[in-house]
């Protein structure tokens, strides 16, 4: 059970010539109101038949007058969504009719009278739990722009509401076999009525009275644990005499999937990948055209004009899949340089570049070093988008303002003492070590290691570092 | 602008051949489904054949009348429809049209301005 | 194959008037989809046939709003809310949900 809502966003005349004229004038204020049918995707019925899945009837619109000589604008709406509940499962596919109604409100003899201003029609894809769909159709001069969604009602949860949804018995986890029903984590998929008998923690079904185990176990009622010690395959379904996990057919053996999908195994299922104008769970849905208009989101349909013809959808920027349902996270492609943040605002993409980088893609490097001074003779060096001073021996800090401790470093390695000197520092080494850092060990022959003291230095001798 | 132009009309004798082009231009051609409609001189309009576009197969049909005789091919690099027509008949005789339809966006239904094909011995 | 037939099939007309063209089919153009696979076409004297109507009640692209196209299953009608001379010339139905694609005999519309 559910409930598909439809939001009337604006009606008014379409773009191009032939702007219709206002279906109210002083003489005859009239206010308007909306009616919405909904039948079943794939119902053969004509457009007189009965709404299937549903009607729904809106509030009556603000009264409005027309300004004399003035085109006719979008018209003022009624408040509030039109809802229309359904009991059964949600199709995903359906028809839709959209009648927009006029009420004239003059001196009529019993009452205001009713005159159909415009129906749109059309026929869609629709999962129940997403985000709300934007459609505009045009009947004749006038355009209607709207929104639409399905949402379950709770307990029931899933694409077509078929799934239920209990409070969590146990406050950390759901059940064996169950999942958290997104977007209520709080709460776990409920289960199926299983056959009787059948083991809550090692079995389960997607179809009432049956069970079906969880890998490991066996038996009618999934209570026998599998010894796979002698078994030659690791798929089930499950042996009840040898305990084995025996070969036997997978999900997909047999190729459910109709009209040329291709079936994947998902853990508990399997999946079908429909080729282009098949969709459902088994790829059994065909039929659908571009004149059901089922290019999502601004997207142009391409196509034959035939009932069986195939249909492409060519998607605006920000849109994918086949029909342009799925905005593109298109900051996942990191077009933002040198670290550069992205934002995707819908119509396009900004980045915030980070200091000293700028540029539509942060792609240019600015001259870091311009108008910036290192002092005490430091040179300035560009790189990662900020300066930085190379400083003369003596000084450091940001721009080489600061007199460096050239000992603060402990340079002089193995005890040596380090002595701040004017052009740098210089390590008196301890007995045993030689080199500019002390770094050298001196063997006990006289010989140093590598490399050798120069000529003029005994080791043991304090060295200039220079 | 969109364009559909014939060419290929003329006399022919019955039993004779003659193979028809269609250039297309002013709208994506592999789009859209192309066929052939006639109208004999006074007379009505006859559809007499069609290729599908590729993603619905490119395949072909034919009227009754033509069927075994005439033949549809197309060359989307060429923006070209064909018609191959053999074994003429002097009931052939018609303004030959040639037809584009599908969507782009929006439903198109564009025609050319025809070309006379006369059977006659 | 799918029998069109028209009604009138000839047509005097006087302009400023409205004028309906009736067309019915030997078996239903309503498919699964919903929807019904008729076109109207008028050819003017001298012409190629131009589309006016698709799937039996759509308004081809720069139509004017005056057309209008009704009906379901086999019975179809075309109005003319009011005729202007440029209106005249044959008006043909066909049907386009099963090759071969069948059209009606016409309809010659003329000013009185």
């Known amino acids: 059970a559910g409930v598909f809502e439809l939001q009337i966003h604006s009606f008014g005349p379409g773009p191009g010539p032939g702007a219709p004229r206002s279906p109210c004038s002083a003489r005859l204020p009239c206010r308007l109101f909306f009616r919405v049918c909904l039948k079943p995707g794939l119902s053969e019925e004509a457009a007189e038949s009965p709404c299937a899945l549903g009607a729904a009837l809106s509030a009556r619109g603000p009264v409005y007058t027309e300004q004399p000589g003035a085109p006719a604008p979008d018209l003022p709406l009624p408040d509030g969504l039109l809802q229309v509940p359904f009991r059964d499962a949600w199709p995903g596919t359906f028809s839709f009719i959209i009648e927009t109604w006029r009420e004239e409100l003059g001196d009529q003899i019993g009452g205001p009278a009713w005159s159909l201003l415009a129906r749109v029609a059309g026929r869609r894809r629709l999962a129940a739990g997403g985000p709300w769909a934007r459609d505009i159709q045009r009947a004749g001069a006038w355009e209607l722009r709207f929104s639409y969604r399905a949402r379950c009602e709770p307990p029931a949860v899933g694409t077509a509401c078929t799934r239920l949804c209990r409070p969590r018995s146990a406050p950390s986890r759901c059940g064996p076999g169950l999942r958290p029903c997104a977007p209520l984590e709080d709460e776990c998929e409920a289960p199926l009525v299983c056959r009787a008998g059948c083991s809550p923690e090692h079995g389960f079904c997607e179809q009432p009275g049956e069970c079906r185990c969880l890998e490991g176990w066996t038996g009618p009622l999934c209570t026998v644990p599998v010894s796979t010690s002698s078994c030659l395959s690791p798929r089930g379904p499950s042996s009840a005499t040898t305990g084995c996990l025996v070969p036997g057919p997978g999900p997909c053996d047999g190729n459910p999937c109709a009209n040329g999908g291709s079936c994947s195994e998902t853990p508990r299922s399997f999946e079908c990948t429909c080729p282009r104008g098949f969709y459902g769970l088994r790829c059994e849905v065909s039929g659908v055209t571009c004149a059901d208009g089922p290019c999502f989101n601004g997207g142009l349909c391409v196509g034959g004009a035939d009932p069986d013809s195939a249909y492409i959808c060519h998607c605006p920027p920000g849109f994918q899949g086949s029909n342009c349902e799925k905005r593109v996270d298109r900051c996942s492609l990191q077009p933002c340089r040198n670290g550069g943040l992205c934002l995707d605002l819908g119509h396009a993409l900004r980045c915030r570049c980070r200091a000293g980088f700028a540029g539509p893609r942060c792609e240019h490097d600015l001259d870091d070093c311009a108008g910036r001074a290192c002092a005490n003779g430091g040179t300035c060096v560009e790189g990662g988008g900020a300066h930085r001073c190379s400083c003369a021996l003596g000084f450091g800090g940001r721009d080489c303002r600061e007199r460096a401790d050239p000992c603060a470093a402990r340079p002089c390695a193995h005890g040596g003492r380090c002595y701040a000197h004017f052009s740098g520092l210089v390590c008196a080494c301890a007995p045993g070590y030689m080199g500019a850092r002390c770094e050298f060990p001196v063997h006990p022959d006289g010989a140093s290691a590598l490399p050798a003291a120069p000529p003029g230095l005994r080791p043991g001798d304090p060295q200039r570092y220079l | 602008e969109v364009q559909l132009v014939e060419s290929g009309g003329g006399l022919v004798k019955p039993g004779g051949s003659l193979r028809l082009s269609c250039a297309a231009s002013?709208?994506?051609?592999?789009?859209?489904?192309m066929s052939w409609v006639r109208q004999a001189p006074g007379k009505g309009l006859e559809w007499v054949g069609r290729?599908?576009?590729?993603?619905?197969?490119?395949?072909?049909d034919f009227a009754a009348p033509v069927k075994g005789r005439f033949t549809i091919s197309r060359d989307d690099s060429k923006n070209t429809l064909y018609l191959q027509m053999n074994s003429l008949k002097a009931e052939d005789t018609a303004v030959y049209y040639c037809?584009?339809?599908?969507?782009?966006?929006?439903?198109?239904?564009?025609w050319g301005q025809g070309t006379l094909v006369t059977v006659s011995s | 194959d799918i029998v069109m037939t028209q009604t009138p099939l000839s047509l005097p007309v006087t302009p400023g008037e409205p004028a309906s063209i009736s067309c019915r089919s030997s078996q239903s153009l309503l498919h699964s989809n919903g929807y019904n696979y008729l076109d109207w076409y008028l050819q003017k004297p001298g012409q190629s046939p131009q589309l006016l109507i698709y799937l039996g009640s759509n308004r081809a692209s720069g139509v004017p709003d005056r057309f209008s196209g009704s009906g379901s299953g086999t019975d179809f009608t075309l109005k003319i809310s009011r005729v202007e001379a440029e209106d005249v010339g044959i008006y043909y139905c066909m049907q386009a949900l099963q090759t071969p694609f069948t059209f009606g005999p016409g309809t010659k519309v003329e000013i009185k």
């Open positions: 002013g709208f994506i051609f592999n789009n859209a489904g």
């Open positions: 037809t584009a339809r599908g969507w782009y966006g929006d439903y198109f239904d564009y």
């Open positions: 290729i599908k576009n590729k993603i619905d197969g490119g395949t072909t």
